[in-house]
C-alpha cells in the first residue's frame, strides 16, 4: 500500500479494509485476519463478530464488512442485528420466562413465535362463530343467523390479529 500524501490528514486516504498504521509512519496497512474496517480513514480495524453457540454465521466477515449471524434451527433472532436468540415454540404455545407454555383457553398462536392472542369476537361484528377456535387457530366468523337467506353462503374470515410482532412474555 502506498504512503498517503494528504497534507491535512494522511489517514484520510486509507480505504475501507485498511487502517492507518501509526507504527509504520501512517502507512495504510490491510486489516489483520478476523478484523475489518467498513469505512476509510480508520486508525484501527474492528474485530469481526463471531457466531458461536446458538448463533450461526449468515455472512462471513470480510476485510470491509462485519460477519452477520442468525440463529440455529429451533431458535429465532431477537434484538437489533440478531443480538440474542430465543427458542421457537410449537403453534398453540407462547414463550414465557419459564419456557414454552400452551395458550390459555380463548387465545391462539398460529406461529412458532409471538404471543397467544384472543380469539376474534364474532359478535362484535354482528356475526356468529362458524368454526370454533383452538389453541392454534382463530375462530372463523360467519354471517349472523338472520343473514342466512337461501343461496347466501359467504364466509367472512376473521380480521387479522395485530402484527405478529416478535414477542413478549
Amino acid at each position: 500500500f502506498e504512503r498517503t500524501r494528504s497534507l491535512q490528514d494522511p489517514c484520510s486516504n486509507c480505504p475501507a479494509g485498511t487502517f492507518c498504521d501509526n507504527n509504520r509512519n501512517q502507512i495504510c496497512s490491510p486489516c489483520p485476519p478476523n478484523s475489518f474496517s467498513s469505512a476509510g480513514g480508520q486508525r484501527t480495524c474492528d474485530i469481526c463478530r463471531q457466531c458461536k453457540g446458538v448463533f450461526r454465521t449468515r455472512k462471513e466477515c470480510s476485510s470491509t464488512s462485519n460477519a452477520e449471524c442468525d440463529c440455529t434451527p429451533g431458535f429465532h433472532c431477537l434484538g437489533a442485528g440478531c443480538s440474542m436468540c430465543e427458542q421457537d415454540c410449537k403453534q398453540g404455545q407462547e414463550l414465557t420466562k419459564k419456557g414454552c407454555k400452551d395458550c390459555c383457553f380463548g387465545t391462539f398462536n398460529d406461529q412458532k413465535r409471538g404471543i397467544c392472542r384472543p380469539w376474534t369476537n364474532c359478535s362484535l361484528d354482528g356475526k356468529s362463530v362458524l368454526v370454533n377456535g383452538t389453541k392454534e387457530r382463530d375462530v372463523v366468523c360467519g354471517p349472523s343467523p338472520a343473514d342466512l337467506s337461501p343461496g347466501a353462503s359467504s364466509v367472512t374470515p376473521p380480521a387479522p390479529a395485530r402484527e405478529p410482532g416478535h414477542s413478549p412474555q
Partner: antibody
Framework: EVQLLESGGGLVQPGGSLRLSCAAS????????MSWVRQAPGKGLEWVAN????????YYGDSATGRFTISRDNSKNTLYLQMNSLRAEDTAVYYC???????????WGQGTLVTVSS | QSVLTQPPSASGTPGQRVTISCSGS????????VYWYQQLPGTAPKLLIY???QRPSGVPDRFSGSKSGTSASLAISGLRSEDEADYYC???????????FGGGTKLTVL
C-alpha cells in the same frame, strides 16, 4: 431502534406523590411485559414492578406493594408508575425496561431521578 | 438485604480470571434462569448473560455464565481494565412473583 424515555422525576416531599412515565418506541409495545427497576444512590438494582402486555396482571416488589401502581396505555405506547406516600428511602434513579419473552432486560431507559426530601 | 447473595467486591490483575458468585434458593435460581448485568458508573445496566450461559452478540467470549443448583457464577477471563464495573445477577422468584437481584459486586482491575 428501540427507545425508552422516562420522565416525571424530581424533588418531592415525604408523604407526597409523583407519576413517572416511560414513552416507548421502535417495537410493538403491546406485545411485551414492561418493568420499572430502581437504583438508590450508591446502591444496587432493585426491581419495583412489572405489568403484562394487556395490563391484566401486575407484580410488585416488597418496597412498592401498597404504595405504587404500575399501569400502561398501549394506545399511547406509554408505561406509568404512580408513586404515593413517598419516603426518603424511595430516592433513586428509576429505570423503565422492556422485558423480553426470554425474561431478560436488554433495553433500558436512561433513568429519571426521584428525590424525596423535605 | 438482597434475596440473591453476591460478594460485595472482587478484584484481579489484567489477564487474570475472576469469578463472581450468586447464591439463591429453590424458588429463584433453583427453578428459573439466571441473568447477569454489567453497570458502568452513571449508565444504565447492560445485559451480559441471559438464560444462565447465553451471551448476546457484542459481549466478548471472555465472559461466561454457569448455574448449578441454587447458585450461579459469572467468570471473566483475560481481565481488562474496561471490565471494571458493578455486576449484578438476577432471576425470577416464584414465591415472591417478582424479579430479584443480587446486591451487586464491584469489580476492580488492579
Amino acid at each position: 431502534e428501540v427507545q425508552l424515555l422516562e420522565s416525571g422525576g424530581g424533588l418531592v416531599q415525604p408523604g407526597g406523590s409523583l407519576r413517572l412515565s416511560c414513552a416507548a418506541s421502535g417495537f410493538t409495545f403491546s406485545d411485551y411485559y414492561m418493568s420499572w427497576v430502581r437504583q438508590a444512590p450508591g446502591k444496587g438494582l432493585e426491581w419495583v414492578a412489572n405489568i403484562k402486555q394487556d395490563g391484566s396482571e401486575k407484580y410488585y416488589g416488597d418496597s412498592a406493594t401498597g404504595r405504587f401502581t404500575i399501569s400502561r396505555d398501549n394506545s399511547k405506547n406509554t408505561l406509568y408508575l404512580q408513586m404515593n406516600s413517598l419516603r426518603a428511602e424511595d430516592t433513586a434513579v428509576y429505570y423503565c425496561a422492556k422485558e423480553e419473552r426470554i425474561g431478560t432486560y436488554y433495553y433500558w431507559g436512561q433513568g429519571t431521578l426521584v428525590t424525596v426530601s423535605s | 438485604q438482597s434475596v440473591l447473595t453476591q460478594p460485595p467486591s472482587a478484584s484481579g490483575t489484567p489477564g487474570q480470571r475472576v469469578t463472581i458468585s450468586c447464591s439463591g434458593s429453590s424458588s429463584n435460581i433453583g427453578s428459573n434462569y439466571v441473568y447477569w448485568y454489567q453497570q458502568l458508573p452513571g449508565t444504565a445496566p447492560k445485559l451480559l448473560i441471559y438464560r444462565n450461559n447465553q451471551r448476546p452478540s457484542g459481549v466478548p467470549d471472555r465472559f461466561s455464565g454457569s448455574k448449578s443448583g441454587t447458585s450461579a457464577s459469572l467468570a471473566i477471563s483475560g481481565l481488562r481494565s474496561e471490565d471494571e464495573a458493578d455486576y449484578y445477577c438476577a432471576a425470577w422468584d416464584d414465591s415472591l412473583s417478582g424479579w430479584v437481584f443480587g446486591g451487586g459486586t464491584k469489580l476492580t482491575v488492579l
